[in-house]
Structures are given as structure tokens and as C-alpha cells.
Amino acid sequence: AIVFIKQPSSQDALQGRRALLRCEVEAPGPVHVYWLLDGAPVQDTERRFAQGSSLSFAAVDRLQDSGTFQCVARDDVTGEEARSANASFNIKWIEAGPVVLKHPASEAEIQPQTQVTLRCHIDGHPRPTYQWFRDGTPLSDGQSNHTVSSKERNLTLRPAGPEHSGLYSCCAHSAFGQACSSQNFTLSIADESFARVVLAPQDVVVARYEEAMFHCQFSAQPPPSLQWLFEDETPITNRSRPPHLRRATVFANGSLLLTQVRPRNAGIYRCIGQGQRGPPIILEATLHLAEIEDMPLFEPRVFTAGSEERVTCLPPKGLPEPSVWWEHAGVRLPTHGRVYQKGHELVLANIAESDAGVYTCHAANLAGQRRQDVNITVATVPSWLKKPQDSQLEEGKPGYLDCLTQATPKPTVVWYRNQMLISEDSRFEVFKNGTLRINSVEVYDGTWYRCMSSTPAGSIEAQARVQVLEKLKFTPPPQPQQCMEFDKEATVPCSATGREKPTIKWERADGSSLPEWVTDNAGTLHFARVTRDDAGNYTCIASNGPQGQIRAHVQLTVAVFITFKVEPERTTVYQGHTALLQCEAQGDPKPLIQWKGKDRILDPTKLGPRMHIFQNGSLVIHDVAPEDSGRYTCIAGNSCNIKHTEAPLYVVDKPVPEESEGPGSPPPYKMIQTHHHHHH
């Protein structure tokens, strides 16, 4: 059976705030959970949505979320449906509304000494408490001539007299919060001696050195007085103008004219009307100096044909708010069509190539005009001028593959070799026009090449196969000097490649034929048993039909390979004594001997007084020290081969003779000369 682990419960909620109705279910089968509001399924919206099995409210709405919520779980194996307990919200809210005239029925019926009732249309749950204001001053219940009915949300003035005239507003507050009237009521009960506003001055914005006019008129019986003040309460009259308002004129009808306005004239102007009775009426208006800042620069834009794009023109800061319009080719853009202006945006729908060009955003106000250009490029898909062709490229020479395309903006070209991107290096170079240069063509360059030309609008690609025309060449070229061991078998290889498989043959440089014990087998010269007469110059000739022939000259030397007659032995020497490491080698040509001591070659010209290498190859070290210990290698070499052999040298302290030892007692050390190390 289905079990509710958590059930939704009724709760208080605040209008516009988050809330969560919890529901957690356990069932043996696959369970599907959904929510009902007054028996109808709840559809997910951004404001109200299922969160797991629970129902989440991003912002509670008193109209849409009033009612009974229920969580329903369905087991889709058995079909069983279980419904949770009902849950609802007690939504707390407050909503502003206007102050309206309840009695009499119209303003025209308001006369002095009649009863006037105003109603505050602020509503909420729980019911809020109300506070009334006249001209911003709170009215407390029980004051003379008015009563406040909180339940009715009414303010009653009885009887209403001129002293009740003013702007009436109300505020209400509850546990949810507070709100004030969205529209206030002006009660005007005439007392002829009170000043009344006929014309109030308005805020003005003017350009520098232009003129500004403020109108101000009051009426009363007898006529009221009118006075203008600027910012610092300085009175402005035609007789006494303050220094910074030399160009001010007050007309008989109360209007104030300022000519050649400068920054110091900007500020608040007050017009004060005073009747024979009643309070003065102070009206304010501000004079602003028009200004306009510079416009930010546009980045050039690249668009693709067929798409819809927008470019927003941020108007420069200015007063008054600058108006913005777009122009193209000197013509103002319309507010509809395919290319049009919407708000501050330039809109290009279904972009065509012909839309490319310079578009100008203009901004203007009283202070002047600013403009900024944006360069629009319409990207086109590249088209072919020349595709890469299947090519035969010669080995060792530069090779070129074309990939010539045109588009706007200039397309970028990349090359692939065997599906791998070619990065430019010493061998490959991609020219500005897209052509690929292979600096020195190699055999393994024979493969597939693909070039791709792209712009933001799209890309095209083509591939070509490269066939490498091989040079006729030796692979590898034979060593020009080679040695053969006397009285042994020897082979001298020679191989070559070309466009066609070359034939290879050997001949002696003097043109004489090869002796019968020397065979030429597919380019390998084979000596069954090397004699002294086999030494000399030989030529390997490789040839094929299309490429002719090439020759490689080889000088063969017959040598007796090196052997050691005497090799150095493992030697132990007392410190300060002399060490002798013998080495003698034989071979033809006669080998030269070099020594390596402790991993560095001992240069006979830089040995110093303690070391010496004899003509026969032996090494002598006088006055040996511990640091002379180590491995010594004798290296014998001639033009044909090289051999080495090594032995360790140990330098030890001479023992101090003990008194107990008789004159005939043997030394504790023997000069050891035992086995040696031998390497080929």
C-alpha cells in the first residue's frame, strides 16, 4: 500500500514570498506523484512547480494559490491511488489603492459647511489599520471637525471648511507590511482670501546660453502677493537681482524669464504665493542645464546571411534623455520591415549580403548630437576559385597544393594530412591565399591532403591525393670508406630506390672485372675470403629506364683487425709508488693506443709530470695518490676498427710496521696483479 511519510499541512504564507508544501511517499511499486488544487491537476510553471514530490512556490499569489491543495500518489503496478490530507495557505497580503471621494457623489457638489467623506482603498489580509494624512501631516482621531472610522476605512470632515483644503493621503499597515495610497485626493474648499494655485512652475531643461521661462500664478481676493526665490533663499525682483541672476526678469503675471542661462543658474526656483489669510503656498521647479556625453565605440560585427541579429546602441548619458535613431547610407531606418529600429536596437532580419556596410547610431538632445558608426560585415560561405588537385610531386623539391577560395570576411584555410591538422613547421607552410607548400617533398608525403576554408557563415572543403615521384637514390648511400677483415668473408651492401625499381651492379673503379671469388648478388658485393688484392676502389651503379643511372664510389680497405697482445691487469699500488698498466695491440694498419682514465680520455700532450704513455702503449703513473684509483681503459684503433680493454687500479695506504713484527715478516699487502677485464 502507499504510505505518506510527509503530508502537506496548512500554513501561513506571505504574498510574493517562497513556500513549500511537503509530500513524501513510499510504495512497493513505481510511484507517480502529482498535485491537485481544488480537485484539478496543478501544472508546473516557473512560479509554482513540483520539486521531487513536494510542491514549491517561488512567489505565493493570493489569487492563484487560494484553495485546497492535495498530493496524490499513484502506484503504476497496482493502479492504487492515495490522496494526502488537504492543505491550504493563509496568505497575508496588503495592496495599495487610491483615496476616493465617497460623499458627496462628485467634487462639484463640495461646498463649504457640507460633510465630506473620503475612503482609503488599501486592502489586505489580515485587515490593516489605517492612518490619514493632510499635506503629509498625520490626522489623529478625535481632532476637531473630523472623525476616522477604521472599520470603514473612512475619513469624515463635518462640516468641511477652507481650513480642510489640502492633499489627503492614507497609509495602512498589518502583520504583512505596509502600503500607502497609490493616488491621493486634493480637497479644495474655497476661501477667497486664501491663495490658490492657478499655474504652477514646471521643471525645465535648457541648453547653455538659451533662455528659460517659469510660469507661476496664484489667485485670491484681495489679490495675493507673489515672490520668487533661488536656491539660497535669495529673492529675485526686477529691482534687486542677485549677482548670478543678472539676466532674470519677473513679469507682472508672475512669470520668471532667465536669459543666456549658464551652469551657475541651474538649481531650484521657488515661487511663493501669500493670500490675506491662510498659509503661504510654496511651489518649486528646477532648472537643469542640458548635457550629453560621448558614445561608446562599437566593435565591428560579423553576421551570417539568413540569420537575425541585433546591435544595441546604448544612448549616452544626457539631460534630457537623448533620443536615439539609426541611419544607414544617410537614411534613417524605419521602425518595421526587414532592417529596422526597435527601441535602441538595430534589427537585421534574414540578413542579406547587401546589408553589409556602415550603420550609424545617432543620439541627440538639447545639448547637441553624438554619433557612432558600426561596421557590419555579412559573412558568406566560401566559394572555390581553385580546388586542390591530385598531384605528382617530385621528391626533394618543393611541392604546392592550391586551395584558393573567396568569401567575406577573408576565409581562414587549414590543411589536414591523413585527417591530422598540419601545423606550420620547417616542412610545411600555408600561404595567405591558402596554398600549401611542402618545402622538400619526402616519400612518405604521398597521401591524402584536405583543405578546409571557413568563415563564420560556414565552410567548404576538398581533398587531393599526392603521389610522390621518387628520386633515383641509394637507400642508404654506401659508406665511401669501408674495411674488410683479411682472410674472412665480407659483404658490401648497395641498395637504391626510384620511380621504377632500379637494377644494381658493382664494378671495380678501374673497369676490371670482379675475381671469381667475388660475387655481385642483387647489389650485395660478396667476398668469400678477403685477400690483400681485394682492396681498392669499387663503384655501385643503380639504373632504371626513366631516370638513368647513379653511381656511388667505395674505397675498400683490407685490414687485419685489432687484437691485444698485452692487456692491462687489475693492479694494486701503495700510495706514492709507481703504477704500470701495460697495453699492446696489433693489427693492420698498425693500431694507435689511447687511454681513458676515470671516464675521460688522457691526452698525451696534457698528462703532466706524473703520467706517461710509452711508445708501445703502456701507461705509467708515478707517485700515485688515492684519487688515481679507478678504471683505466686501453683503446686501440685504426682506420678499420677499434677495440678496448680495461682494468681497475687500486691505490692503498702503506702499512706502518708494528714492533712485534720481525725484520723478515711479510708485508700485509701484496702487489696484486690478477685477472683483467676485456671488452670488444
Epitope: 511499486g29 513505481p30 510511484v31 507517480h32 502529482y34 491537485l36 480537485g39 484539478a40 491537476p41 521531487g52 496524490v72 499513484r74 502506484d75 503504476d76 503496478v77 497496482t78 493502479g79 492504487e80 491511488e81 492515495a82 490522496r83
Partner: antibody
Framework: QVQLVQSGAEVKRPGASVKVSCKTS????????MHWVRQAPGKGLEWIGV????????SYNQKFKGRVTMTRDTSTSTVYMELSSLTSEDTAIYYC??????WGQGTLVTVSS | DIVITQTELSLPVTPGERASISCRSS???????????LNWFLQKPGQSPQLLIY???TRASGVSDRFSGSGSGTDFTLKISRVEAEDVGVYYC?????????FGQGTKLEIK
């Protein structure tokens, strides 16, 4: 025991509507939801929708939206499925299923001109 | 919509042998509660479908223990340990994660 008995076979003209019934017994009708599934000849199973028998709420497969109407009569413990604007593609066996554990015997609906 | 794919449309088996039927989903069928919402049905010739397995591996009431279900979030298998002649029919898998509930095309088990 749980029993779902469906109405008999129907033959309809293209453009017409068909209403298939599924009478239930052996359990408390309003405690269980009912699914409808159809199977075209030689084809697989296709879910049409589900009705909650308590409130009568429905969830339909978008494919049938606007053509299918599922209703229930709690007094007779019967669920109905009506399909309108019939075409030959709607020729199939229509099954009602309580959950997916208990199935009706199926109703063959043939749409032919 | 979630797409349920049964690759083998037909599966010939020798009686007594083991059979495996696979099913794949285009989206994970594992819900936040950790359960995998997949059903297996058998429709014998001329009959209504019958539920074999629910929640991927739970046998429905009265279903033989020769049937077992397993899988991951998107790949599922129904195994029959020793096939009997009465097991022939079309096997369907079905997802219950989101509307519309969708079925696989079905795999027909036949006796060799």
C-alpha cells in the same frame, strides 16, 4: 477478485468516433487509476493515457491530445475512452489496465471505409 | 519522449536453456528515490499482456522465479533461467519515468 471487462468489437468509418468501456469489479473503484493502451495488428504496445477515478483527472499522451477523452462513471464503476477523428491508423486492440498489473481482455476497433 | 529500444526482434531458444532479452533507454530510468522505473511484460499469443517484473528487478505476484530482471540506469536485461514451452510470446519493456509512458518494440521468444 479484480475483473476488467471491456465492451465488444467495433467497426467505424474514417472520421467517426468510438467509445470503448471498461467495467470493473472486485475492488473499490475510486481507489485505483486506469490506464489505456493500444496495440495495432502485429505491432507493439502504445500508451494512450491514464485517468484518476476519484476526481476524474486525466493525463494523455500528446500524440492523442485533442482526439482522446477519458471519463468514468463512479455509480457503475466503469471507465470510458473515446477516440475521435478516426483513421485507418487507429485500427488496433484497445486495452484498459488497472495500474499495469491487471488488464482487460481488449476491444478490437477496426476503422475502414 | 523517452525512446525504448529492444534490439533483438526475435530470439530462438532451446527448451531448458537460458535466455536473455535486452532493452535500452535513451535516458536514465533511475529516479531520485533510487528506484529504476522499468517494467517487463509477456504477451502470449492471443492474450492481453501480463506484468512479469516491475522496478527493474521485482517479480510481480505469481511470476515464476525463473524470471529475473537486472540492469543499470539505461541498459536492462530480462533473464529466463530455464526456458519452457509456455514462455513463448512477445516480451516488452516499458518506462514509467515520464509521460508518455513508452514501450520497447518487443522481442519474440520462439522455441527452436
Amino acid at each position: 477478485q479484480v475483473q476488467l471487462v471491456q465492451s465488444g468489437a467495433e467497426v467505424k468509418r474514417p472520421g467517426a468516433s468510438v467509445k470503448v468501456s471498461c467495467k470493473t469489479s472486485g475492488y473499490t473503484f475510486t481507489d485505483y487509476a486506469m490506464h489505456w493502451v493500444r496495440q495495432a495488428p502485429g505491432k507493439g504496445l502504445e500508451w494512450i493515457g491514464v485517468i484518476s477515478t476519484y476526481y476524474g483527472n486525466v493525463s494523455y499522451n500528446q500524440k492523442f491530445k485533442g482526439r482522446v477523452t477519458m471519463t468514468r462513471d463512479t455509480s457503475t464503476s466503469t471507465v470510458y475512452m473515446e477516440l475521435s477523428s478516426l483513421t485507418s491508423e487507429d485500427t488496433a486492440i484497445y486495452y484498459c489496465a488497472r495500474g499495469f498489473a491487471y488488464w482487460g481482455q481488449g476491444t478490437l476497433v477496426t476503422v475502414s471505409s | 519522449d523517452i525512446v525504448i529500444t529492444q534490439t533483438e526482434l526475435s530470439l530462438p531458444v532451446t527448451p531448458g536453456e537460458r535466455a536473455s532479452i535486452s532493452c535500452r533507454s535513451s535516458k536514465s530510468l533511475q529516479k531520485k528515490d533510487g528506484k529504476t522505473y522499468l517494467n517487463w511484460f509477456l504477451q502470449k499469443p492471443g492474450q492481453s499482456p501480463q506484468l512479469l517484473i516491475y522496478l527493474m528487478s521485482t517479480r510481480a505476484s505469481g511470476v515464476s522465479d525463473r524470471f529475473s530482471g537486472s540492469g543499470s540506469g539505461t541498459d536492462f536485461t530480462l533473464k529466463i533461467s530455464r526456458v519452457e514451452a509456455e514462455d513463448v510470446g512477445v516480451y516488452y519493456c516499458q518506462q514509467l519515468v515520464e509521460y508518455p509512458f513508452t514501450f520497447g518494440q518487443g522481442t519474440k521468444l520462439e522455441i527452436k
